[in-house]
Amino acid sequence: NKILVKQSPMLVAYDNAVNLSCKYSYNLFSREFRASLHKGLDSAVEVCVVYGNYSQQLQVYSKTGFNCDGKLGNESVTFYLQNLYVNQTDIYFCKIEVMYPPPYLDNEKSNGTIIHVKGKHLCPSPLFPGPSKP
């Protein structure tokens, strides 16, 4: 038995930040779980982890180079990614594992979310504007 995960197909980070919501076909209330966010088609790079259990507050871990926060809903974990760089544009996959109570459960691989990080294109005003046309 596998948990199903729904993610937005694409998100655009205009201000170098984005909220990626991972929606699960499973209620995480009073469960011990580990939710993670993986970068790349092969999910090779785990960038954020949210660990939760019934007795302590949510714990969030960010890999070096990523600024991550996490928020828990009954059937969702939202990853808030900040200070993203243009070169972090990629596909990101949500993963969930539930350890307790038994049985151990994890998810079917989701379709992922393409996060497109838009660079800030600032147009500098010229110091010495040319002669104005009549």
């Epitope: 580990r34 993670s36 785990e46 982890v49 714990q59 871990y61 070096t64 594992e97 350890m99 994890d106």
Partner: nanobody, 124 residues
Framework: EVQLVESGGGEVQPGGSLRLSCAAS????????MGWFRQAPGKGREFVAA????????DYAESVKGRFTISRDNAKNTVYLQMNSLRAEDTAVYYC?????????????????WGQGTLVTVKP
């Protein structure tokens, strides 16, 4: 809940070697990391080395690179620290830590559980 038990500490002469072990038990997820930190008398706990479950990510403190090697046996849920060319400044209590992060974190705050520590003494 995760329990960590360290072993392998002892007294050794400068230039000598020791191998520390840390066995983890409890509920494990598909990825996590374990690391070694050390605390010399009167100093804070400092990062030594870490490795993740997949064994595709390891990290070392600059002061131990080339001398210490971290490895793990996933079947035994055990991580090892092979310490060669030991120096007097390596004398400390060595602690094993466990984190739910899936990478070799050097941040002490990322570690959720700690072992009781094992003393390493390097002296002539």
């Amino acid at each position: 809940e995760v329990q960590l038990v360290e072993s392998g500490g002892g007294e050794v002469q400068p230039g000598g070697s020791l191998r520390l072990s840390c066995a983890a038990s409890g509920r494990m997820f598909s990825n996590y990391a374990m690391g070694w930190f050390r605390q010399a008398p009167g100093k804070g706990r400092e990062f030594v080395a870490a490795i993740n479950y997949r064994r595709d990510d390891a990290d070392y403190a600059e002061s131990v690179k080339g001398r210490f090697t971290i490895s793990r046996d996933n079947a035994k849920n055990t991580v090892y620290l092979q310490m060669n060319s030991l120096r007097a400044e390596d004398t400390a209590v060595y602690y094993c830590g466990f984190t739910y992060a899936g990478w070799a974190s050097s941040r002490r705050d990322d570690y959720n559980y700690w072992g009781q520590g094992t003393l390493v003494t390097v002296k002539p």
